[in-house]
């Protein structure tokens, strides 16, 4: 099943995020992604957890996951590579970097996003927008068309409150309220943007969704630039 | 690794104040709310209140509001709590402890003495 | 306030034995988000309490296996399989679901 969702969220505009990526495995939605570089997308270690034998695709440039679009492009994986220290059971380091077979076709629909390098926290309050083709509702809906919603960033040590996530954020990690408007696992590797710059990368451990008491929790970037600009070197 | 260091014990007079210290060091100090908890001699603990160090916000017991007020320097990654208008029943150990993983680590107390 | 009630006040154990302490809660303790916040400090002479269990079976790092907790509901149990000399002390049981978060009397494990 696909990894993540966008509750309480709207339909995107078209091709307003043009570095928006869809992660698919065997030709379905698997997780989301975002373009950081010509031939790079950058999204979550655990999206692959369960690819072993599949086949892993980037498709680029797209609103509707089923409609046919001048802009759509699928492209094959040339190498994946998860952060070293990421492992199943925890949600520290997860994040993928994904080269592309080719350098992407670049366009209005398909453009690399920015990403933060300054490592400092997003002020809390902060409206950051997070995008996805996860399920839009409890009952398991999946949207054709990309989906998004505006999350208020949440301070960390209200995040690392035992009714939250009991001191498991770290300083590499950042939360956003989640009352009713959520991302979840099924977004898992997409783009949580502030002021029109990657910030956070949204994990892919398993969390109710929804409920203001488990925030969602997203990678920071920043903190992982050297890796980031190494890996893309 | 984690501490937290709290001031020396007092001696007070009844009707005084006084306000005990807790200094953070190994993490950010900003990333975790600190709790306050007291236990009168041979007695259980009950829990005071918490303070978020980012914002300052605060939430009480009912039972020490009006006895209790915390506040935080961020600067010197200390968190602070005063109690006012002591009288002998507020002698007691005073202890912080930090809020996550739940209350994993605590200062080593301030033993507060109420006597005229 | 939600009350935690401790039983026994004390428990005289050999050492090598098993021992058990028992909390009730006088209300459920589960919290809004589903998970339960139930915990267990083990406060020894003259030193702060030290966090054991916490979420009711998790036992939190560096803590022996020996120690294990179980319960549900209003009704949560400590087991300690085969006591040491640094058992010793007293235990509390604690809940963070409600405010105030309470803690339970104390039960002191001592020897017999």
């Known amino acids: 099943p696909p990894r993540g969702r966008i509750l309480g969220g709207r339909e995107a505009e078209a091709h307003a995020r043009p570095y928006m990526a869809s992660v698919q495995l065997n030709g379905a939605h698997l997780c989301g992604g975002v373009l950081v570089a010509e031939q790079w997308v950058l999204s979550a270690a655990h999206c692959l957890e369960d690819a072993a034998d599949g086949k892993v695709q980037v498709l680029l440039g797209a609103h509707s996951l089923s409609q046919p679009e001048p802009s759509k492009r699928l492209y094959d994986v040339l190498r994946a590579v998860p952060h070293p220290d990421s492992q199943p059971d925890t949600i520290d380091h997860d994040l993928l970097l994904l080269q592309l077979s080719e350098k992407a076709t670049l366009g209005p629909a398909v453009r690399p996003l920015p990403w933060q390098r300054v490592d400092r926290d997003v002020a809390p309050g902060t409206l950051c927008d997070v995008a996805g083709w996860g399920i839009v509702n409890h009952a398991g809906r999946r949207p054709d068309s990309l989906q998004h919603v505006l999350l208020p960033v949440l301070d960390r040590a209200t995040c690392n409150r035992r009714t939250h996530h009991d001191g498991a954020i770290t300083e590499r990690l950042m939360c956003a309220e989640s009352n009713r408007r959520d991302s979840c696992k099924g977004d898992s590797g997409g783009p949580l943007v502030c002021g029109g710059v990657l910030e956070g990368v949204v994990t892919s451990g398993s969390r109710v969704c929804g409920n203001r008491k488990k925030p969602g929790i997203y990678t920071r970037v920043a903190s992982y630039a050297a890796w980031i600009d190494s890996v893309l070197a | 690794e984690v501490h937290l260091q709290q001031s020396g014990p007092e001696l007070v007079k009844p009707g005084a104040s006084v306000k005990i210290s807790c200094k953070a060091s190994?993490?950010?100090?900003?990333?975790?709310?600190k709790n306050w908890m007291r236990q009168r001699h041979g007695e259980s603990l009950e829990w005071i209140g918490d303070?978020?160090?980012?914002?300052?916000?605060?939430n009480y017991n009912q039972k020490f509001k009006g006895k209790a007020t915390l506040t935080v320097d961020k600067s010197s990654s200390t968190a602070y709590m005063e109690l006012r208008s002591l009288t002998s029943e507020d002698s007691a150990v005073y202890y912080c402890?930090?809020?996550?993983?739940?209350?994993?680590?605590w200062g080593q107390g301030t033993l507060v003495t109420v006597s005229a | 306030d939600v009350l935690m009630t401790q039983t026994p006040l004390s428990l005289p154990v050999s050492l090598g034995d098993q021992a058990s302490i028992s909390c009730r809660s006088s209300q459920t303790i589960v919290h809004s988000n589903g998970d339960t916040y139930l915990e267990w400090y083990l406060q020894k002479p003259g030193q702060s309490p030290n966090l054991l269990i916490y979420k009711v079976s998790n036992r939190f790092s560096g803590v022996p296996d020996r120690f294990s907790g179980s319960g549900s509901g209003t009704d949560f149990t400590l087991k300690i399989s085969r006591v040491e000399a640094e058992d010793l002390g007293v235990y509390y049981c604690?809940?963070?679901?409600?405010?105030?978060?309470?803690f339970g009397g104390g039960t002191k494990l001592e020897i017999k």
């Open positions: 402890a930090r809020e996550g993983p739940s209350f994993a680590y």
């Open positions: 604690f809940q963070g679901s409600h405010v105030p978060p309470t």
């Open positions: 190994g993490y950010t100090f900003t990333d975790f709310y």
């Open positions: 303070i978020n160090p980012n914002n300052g916000g605060t």
